[in-house]
């Protein structure tokens, strides 16, 4: 059975050209974290978090997402395409799989800042 | 040395799910530098990569199959099982399972080559 | 995802020919090119892994080269037992893909 909950940093705002932290965080249960894939809206890989073996970056996106922190995403450099869905799926044994969602808006104004208010979707 | 043997019914009827096993013999599944994969060929075509599964449990599936695949494993088995949800005559092809190797060090991983293939079972999707 | 776009897609060839394969992906893939062969009813060989380099049992004849986005598949010296489909393959990024497979044919 599925108990466990994905926070997520819900709805967030940044400023073109700055950088955001994409964060996903898993609570209410105590399944091991083996792997997370993150992903955008349109289902294309941004990186993927395996427990043992650590980081594969897309190597699309290897200038611009750094690792971390923790098992979330650093997305820089931020365009106006990069306004949209994002998902983190945590693989957890013995749980399954969690899914969340982020949705990020990337701002020409400057007034634009990103919370870190987790959220439950 | 290490050999897949792909297992599951041949026939399976529209709208129904297919179910296949590969059965890694000759080496561990749980090995930390493999992933495990699962390629169709329609026939007369060429190769479509499904997606992969690692032995903790990790996978990731091709966009356009996630939502209808499931890759599992069963490391007490030494096997990893696909799932294809609502078939149709689409899905008639040869079903192969794989090895690939990781190399992986300073944190960071990479997907090799796929060094070890399964023989290939053929499945028509037909009433 | 990545595209792998193979040609020809299919050559015949005489034997002691010289055969040339190639392989252009989408986008830049580094050295994250492997290619396969598969005869009739058989399942995918692996021949070649990160461009250039041969898997074991593989008959000198068969090389690689490339690098980025273009990429050959070279056969010196055609052999009968070498009529087969080719794939290309790339493991940079997921989705993995392949190419789209060159039959060469025994004249």
């Known amino acids: 059975m599925m108990t466990g909950t994905i926070e997520t940093t819900g709805n967030i705002s940044a400023k073109k050209g700055g950088s955001v932290i994409l964060q996903c965080h898993l609570s209410s249960t105590m399944a091991q974290v083996t792997q997370v894939n993150w992903e955008q809206h349109d289902h294309s890989l941004l990186a993927i978090r395996n427990a043992e073996l650590g980081w594969h970056i897309y190597p699309a996106f290897k200038d611009r997402v750094a690792p971390g922190p923790g098992l979330g995403l650093t997305l820089q450099s931020l365009t106006m395409n990069d306004t949209g869905e994002y998902f983190c799926t945590y693989h957890t044994y013995p749980d399954g799989t969690y899914r969340g969602r982020i949705f990020l808006e990337v701002l020409e104004s400057s007034v634009a800042e990103h919370s870190a208010r987790f959220q439950i979707p | 040395q290490v050999q897949l043997q792909e297992s599951g019914p041949g026939l399976v009827k529209p709208s129904q799910t297919l179910s296949l096993t590969c059965t890694v013999s000759g080496g561990s599944i749980s090995s930390v530098y493999f992933y495990w994969n699962w390629i169709r060929q329609h026939p007369g075509k060429g190769l479509e990569w499904i997606g992969y599964i690692y032995y903790s449990g990790g996978t990731y599936y091709n966009p356009s199959l996630r939502s209808r695949v499931t890759i599992s494993v069963d490391t007490s088995k030494n096997q990893f099982s696909l799932k294809l949800n609502s078939v149709t005559a689409a899905d008639t092809a040869v079903y192969y399972c794989?090895?690939?190797?990781?190399?992986?060090?300073?944190?960071?991983?990479?997907?090799?080559?796929?060094?070890?293939w399964g023989q290939g079972t053929t499945v028509t999707v037909s009433s | 995802e990545i595209v792998l776009t193979q040609s020809p897609d299919f050559q015949s060839v005489t034997p002691k020919e010289k055969v040339a394969i190639t392989c252009r992906a989408s986008?830049?893939?580094?050295?994250?090119l492997h290619w396969y062969q598969q005869k009739p009813d058989q399942s995918p060989k692996p021949l070649i892994k990160y461009v250039s380099q041969s898997f074991s049992g593989v008959p000198s004849r068969f090389s690689g080269s490339g690098s980025g986005t273009d990429f050959t598949l070279t056969i010196n010296s055609l052999e009968a037992e070498d009529a087969a489909t080719y794939y290309c393959h790339q493991s940079s990024s997921l989705p993995l893909t392949f190419g789209g497979g060159t039959k060469v044919e025994i004249k």
């Open positions: 986008q830049s893939i580094g050295s994250s």
């Open positions: 794989a090895r690939g190797s990781i190399a992986a060090g300073g944190g960071y991983f990479y997907y090799n080559d796929m060094d070890v």
